[in-house]
């Protein structure tokens, strides 16, 4: 019968040694056997568990010249870069037979200098304002005690004696570095360094100080900036067209905005080439040598309506007997507003001007009362919109109707509002 | 008697491939770990990677990890260095060596005890 | 990567000569650390391994010891052929990483 298949006699002639080092550790654990006839095939356990998918090799050396003589087998099994889940009883197992053989265990820890699973980060911070650093180490072996340093400075007598793993700062007025060191029975490991930039607070209480209807004028309070200086604000206005959508909250504008820079103090900034009677959201950020704040919410504003910026286009004028009729259009030139309709101002050669509201039809039809003798008579036309009127349009002279001309189909001004006039 | 020889070297344009073979004898290549080591014309050694030739698997320097592969044939005792997208600061003489496993049920790290005796891979300048 | 820096980089040394290069690892590398010799136009030769372990074959002249981050090579008493340049090489973890090199020429 082959050598090995008593449950007595163990064919391991080589057990496992024990491996303890550092995270990141390259090992190699070896067995040997002595086996009669065909070589098993060596498996290796950690912990009782079979290692599917090891990094081991296999080298068989026969001892005799006939393949039913002994052979030694050795088995190396590789560990490449040892870590926590590495760690445990190894063992090699072969079958033999009807039998399962496995060889004395070798031990594999984990012993080093602490390991860093958390360090603290870089970031940002409004001055004065508290925020959370973390950190976070294991051995073993253990225990692992913390110590933060802040600028290079330990924040507590001894490891272990100050914050552990969150450290909490309740707010900084310059820009500094943490780390954190990680003691144990076998040394001290420092964390990276990270960088605390602090940035001035957001500013407050955004607010509009004055309205033109292609212009306004805002201001804001500036929050604390700790020791650096604010260098300049900036403001962004964006169209709130309605699909648009900003929400308060919401970061970045769904269109390029009109950016402006305030050089500060006084937190003030005017800002012009606006559209009038057009909402706007607008926000304010304020600058360091660190870098800018967040930004504000978005603030709606509004820019008030103004008048017409020009007469109303084309405007003819046509006499015929008692009647005439004037018509008109739409100011080419922006409205700055709502259009709410058209003054019409009619005069003849010394006598009074005479102003009617139209309303918003681009013509009227006159009844002249009396013998219509008056001479020179002139029309002229603005448009108004709620902050007022327009400028008017140059004199039109009232011409006579010649037979042929086209005459539109019109009302005659009968409204309370707009009677017939007469000119004595 | 062990014995590693390198063939397959020469030259090669700039992002060619070239397979380096290491046959070995007087011993089996299923039972250590075969490591690839390069040195550049007056340079030091540098490690290029390692095959478990017994389980395949190849473990890769970073210099080089994607364009190399490294293989091996246990019925031929041969190991293989595959090189793909090569550079001309890939130039150097290529030395496949045995990983030497002596040491007891256990070891920490390793050494290479048999080398073979190089294979130059150069570019056209 | 741990880096290994060797010194000096370069000695000139008479035969009988004591001679002693010495090798640096950034981090400990606990005692994974082999020396090699390698003559122009030849394959590098095992020289020690596990940092004062002699291998089979290598006179007794030579010698490797330390752990942790230093580590040196001692050629006893320098022999004609034993000019040559030395590497040391750590394997702590992995890639393994080698020094630069020290040249050992005759004065």
């Known amino acids: 019968a082959p050598r090995g298949t008593q449950a007595e006699e163990s064919p391991f002639v080589g057990n496992p040694g024990n491996i303890t080092g550092a995270r990141g550790l390259t090992g190699t654990l070896r067995c040997q056997l002595q086996v009669q006839g065909e070589p098993p095939e060596v498996h290796w356990l950690r912990d009782g568990q079979i290692l599917e998918l090891a990094d081991s090799t296999q080298t068989q050396v026969p001892l005799g010249e006939d393949e039913q003589d002994d052979w030694i087998v050795v088995s190396q099994l590789r560990i490449t870069s040892l870590q926590l889940s590495d760690t445990g009883q190894y063992q090699c197992l072969v079958f033999l037979g009807h039998q399962t053989f496995v060889s004395q265990p070798g031990y594999v820890g984990l012993e080093g200098l602490p390991y860093f699973l958390e360090e603290p980060e870089d970031r940002t911070v409004a001055a004065n304002t508290p925020f959370n650093l973390s950190c976070q180490a294991q051995g073993p072996p253990e225990p692992v005690d913390l110590l933060w340093l802040q600028d290079a400075v330990p924040l507590a007598t001894a490891p272990g004696h100050g914050p552990q793993r969150s450290l909490h700062v309740p707010g900084l007025n310059k820009t500094s570095s943490f780390s954190c060191e990680a003691h144990n029975a076998k040394g001290v490991t420092t964390s990276r360094t990270a960088t605390i930039t602090v940035l001035p607070q957001q500013p407050r209480n955004l607010h509009l100080v004055s309205r033109q209807p292609t212009e306004l004028e805002v201001a804001w309070t500036p929050g604390l900036s700790g020791i650096y200086p604010l260098t300049h604000c900036t403001l962004q206005a964006v169209l709130s067209d309605d699909g648009m959508g900003i929400q308060a909250g919401e970061p970045d504008p769904p269109e390029e905005p009109l950016t402006s820079q305030a050089s500060v103090p006084p937190h003030q900034l005017r800002l012009g080439s606006l559209h009038p009677h057009t909402p706007y959201h607008i926000r304010v950020a304020c600058t360091s040598s660190q870098g800018p704040s967040s930004w504000t919410h978005w603030l709606p504003v509004e820019t008030p309506e103004g008048v017409p910026l020009g007469p109303p286009e084309n405007i003819s004028a046509t006499r015929n007997g008692s009647q005439a009729f004037v018509h008109w259009q739409e100011p080419r030139a922006p409205l700055q507003g709502t259009l709410l309709g058209y003054r019409l101002a009619y005069q003849g050669q010394d006598t009074p001007e005479v102003l009617m509201d139209i309303g918003l039809r681009q013509e009227v039809t006159l009844e002249l009362q009396g013998d219509g003798s008056v001479s020179n008579l002139t029309v002229c036309v603005a448009a108004y919109t709620a902050a007022g009127d327009g400028p008017w349009s140059l004199p039109v002279p009232l011409e006579a109707w010649r037979p042929g001309q086209a005459q539109p189909v019109h009302q005659l001004v009968k409204e309370p509002s707009t009677p017939a006039f007469s000119w004595p | 008697e062990v014995q590693l020889v390198e063939s397959g070297g020469g030259l090669v344009q700039p992002g060619g491939s070239l397979r380096l073979s290491c046959a070995a004898s007087g011993f089996s290549l299923s039972g250590s770990w075969i490591h690839w080591v390069r040195q550049a014309p007056g340079k030091g050694l540098e490690w290029v990677g390692w095959i478990n030739p017994y389980r395949g698997y190849a473990y890769y320097a970073d210099s080089v990890k994607g364009r190399f592969t490294i293989s091996a044939d246990t019925s031929k005792n041969t190991a293989y260095l595959q090189m793909n997208s090569l550079r001309a600061e890939d130039t150097a003489v290529y030395y496949c060596?045995?990983?030497?496993?002596?040491?007891?049920?256990?070891?920490?790290?390793?050494?290479?005890?048999?080398w073979g005796q190089g294979t130059l891979v150069h570019h056209h300048h | 990567d741990i880096q290994m820096t060797q010194s000096p980089s370069s000695l000139s040394a008479s035969v009988g000569d004591r001679v002693t290069i010495t090798c640096r690892a950034s981090?400990?590398?606990?005692?994974?650390v082999a020396w090699y010799q390698q003559k122009p136009g030849k394959a590098p030769k095992l020289l020690i391994y596990s940092a004062s372990f002699l291998y089979s074959g290598v006179p007794s002249r030579f010698s490797g010891s330390g752990s942790g981050t230093d580590f040196t090579l001692t050629i006893s008493s320098l022999q004609p052929e034993d000019f040559a340049t030395y590497y040391c090489q750590q394997s702590y973890t992995t890639p393994p990483t080698f020094g630069q090199g020290t040249k050992v020429e005759i004065k």
């Open positions: 981090q400990d590398v606990s005692t994974a």
């Open positions: 060596a045995r990983e030497y496993s002596g040491w007891g049920g256990s070891s920490v790290g390793y050494a290479m005890d048999y």
